[in-house]
Amino acid sequence: LIIGFGISGRHSITVTTVASAGNIGEDGILSCTFEPDIKLSDIVIQWLKEGVLGLVHEFKEGKDELSEQDEMFRGRTAVFADQVIVGNASLRLKNVQLTDAGTYKCYIITSKGKGNANLEYKTGAFSMPEVNVDYNASSETLRCEAPRWFPQPTVVWASQVDQGANFSEVSNTSFELNSENVTMKVVSVLYNVTINNTYSCMIENDIAKATGDIKVTESEIKRRSHLQLLNSKAS
């Protein structure tokens, strides 16, 4: 969490941002809130990106003002116009690109004063893994697949029964470049699997951590997946 205060003039307002991560090719949110004003027409929101010459986004007098928007953001940004009045200056960024990563500034002007806060935005690719029993293999084998990751993640297997065991000798992980030549498909195979055990396939890079669990018993197979973004710090 980053909390910024206005420094010019007699009055300052509190602006708060939260560091976040964007998934390449999907839509992302750059989060920013501020002390609300009673009149929408008195609120100005400017989003800036370090090293970028034009504006990322500008909202003033109740509407977008994008005449000086940087060419790399054309058609890709929007604020939540109906929520500005209650202090939400968050920016929706469409079709996130690798090059969108960097330091952004959320700059606010209201009738009460000015304020700004920075936000670190990471970009990459992350997806839920799915773990299945590989019935084509000669021995009991598990296959963990996740369609989109970037940068290249690490893959670690764990099991409930053999806690702390190192499965690197009995697993094989491969990374296959996807058609857009940036993200990769992750495939990890675990051999010599025993039944009545829960196995976890953990995929992690500096942006996200995802886990796919599979419980294999004689009568059933249960699966569960979850994903968490790393380093979501507020300012």
């Epitope: 090293g51 970028v52 010459l53 034009g54 504006l55 986004h57 977008d64 003002e65 994008l66 005449s67 000086e68 928007q69 940087d70 060419e71 790399m72 054309r74 058609g75 890709r76 940004t77 929007a78 690109q97 090059t99």
Partner: antibody
């Protein structure tokens, strides 16, 4: 007067690399993006990418990622494009262009072009 | 990527006549936030770099004669030369200026009868 002066023609062997320069004058170099285009003989134009002279950050057309490397040298007001692992398909005229506005395109000022010929 | 399609590929003209050429984009080039259509027109003569004529679909670049007019919105655009001159003989390109990667049409060649 805004001017972009590109380096002269180059004859290079397949598999080799070439580095084209684009020297800017008549304006504040760090204030405007520089873009690079490719024009094969008798064909249309392809956008290779842009570089921010302010910090050297490049953005590439996916098609040219890994083939073209865009850099700048602020001390000499010069933008560079290095083309790597050249094949005959890379034979073309390459242009640098400066945008009209500080925030971006259109491409208002163009270099005279640099002819690159890839041949054994 | 946005595909730009120009027609016709060539035009045989006589000095003084009115000329129109078309450019179509595979996606809309209109941006509601700036109320602009990010479509650019260039012309290019042999051995020369392209020259900017029209940007934002209808804004004439400084120094470009007023016989050149750009029109259209969304995905359909037109360049009109009200009274073509011999110095206008060139290849005309339209360009998607809206989103990366910027893309160009294949061109319309203006030739003398």
């Amino acid at each position: 007067e805004v001017q972009l002066q590109q380096s002269g023609p180059d004859l290079v062997k397949p598999g080799a690399s070439v580095k084209i320069s684009c020297k800017a004058s008549g304006y504040s170099f760090t204030g405007y993006y520089i873009h690079w285009m490719k024009q094969s003989h008798g064909k249309s134009l392809e956008w290779i990418g842009r570089v921010n002279p302010n910090n050297g950050d490049p953005i590439y057309n996916q098609k040219f990622r890994g083939k073209a490397i865009l850099t700048v040298d602020q001390s000499s007001n010069t933008a560079y494009m290095e083309l790597r692992s050249l094949t005959s398909e890379a034979s073309a005229v390459y242009y640098c262009a400066r945008v009209l506005f500080y925030y971006g395109s259109p491409f208002a000022y163009w270099g005279q072009g640099t002819l690159v010929t890839v041949s054994a | 990527d946005i595909v730009m399609t120009q027609s016709p590929s060539s035009l045989i003209v006589t000095a003084g006549e009115k000329v129109t050429m078309s450019c179509r984009s595979s996606q809309s080039l209109f941006d509601s936030g700036s109320q602009r259509n990010y479509l650019t027109w260039f012309h290019q003569k042999p051995g020369r770099p392209p020259k900017l004529l029209i940007y934002w679909a209808s804004t004439r670049e400084s120094g470009v004669p007023d016989r050149f007019t750009g029109s259209g919105s969304g995905t359909d655009f037109t360049l009109t030369i009200s009274s073509v001159q011999t110095e206008d003989l060139a290849v005309y390109f339209c360009q998607n200026d809206y989103s990366f990667p910027f893309t160009f049409g294949s061109g319309t060649k203006l030739e003398e009868k």
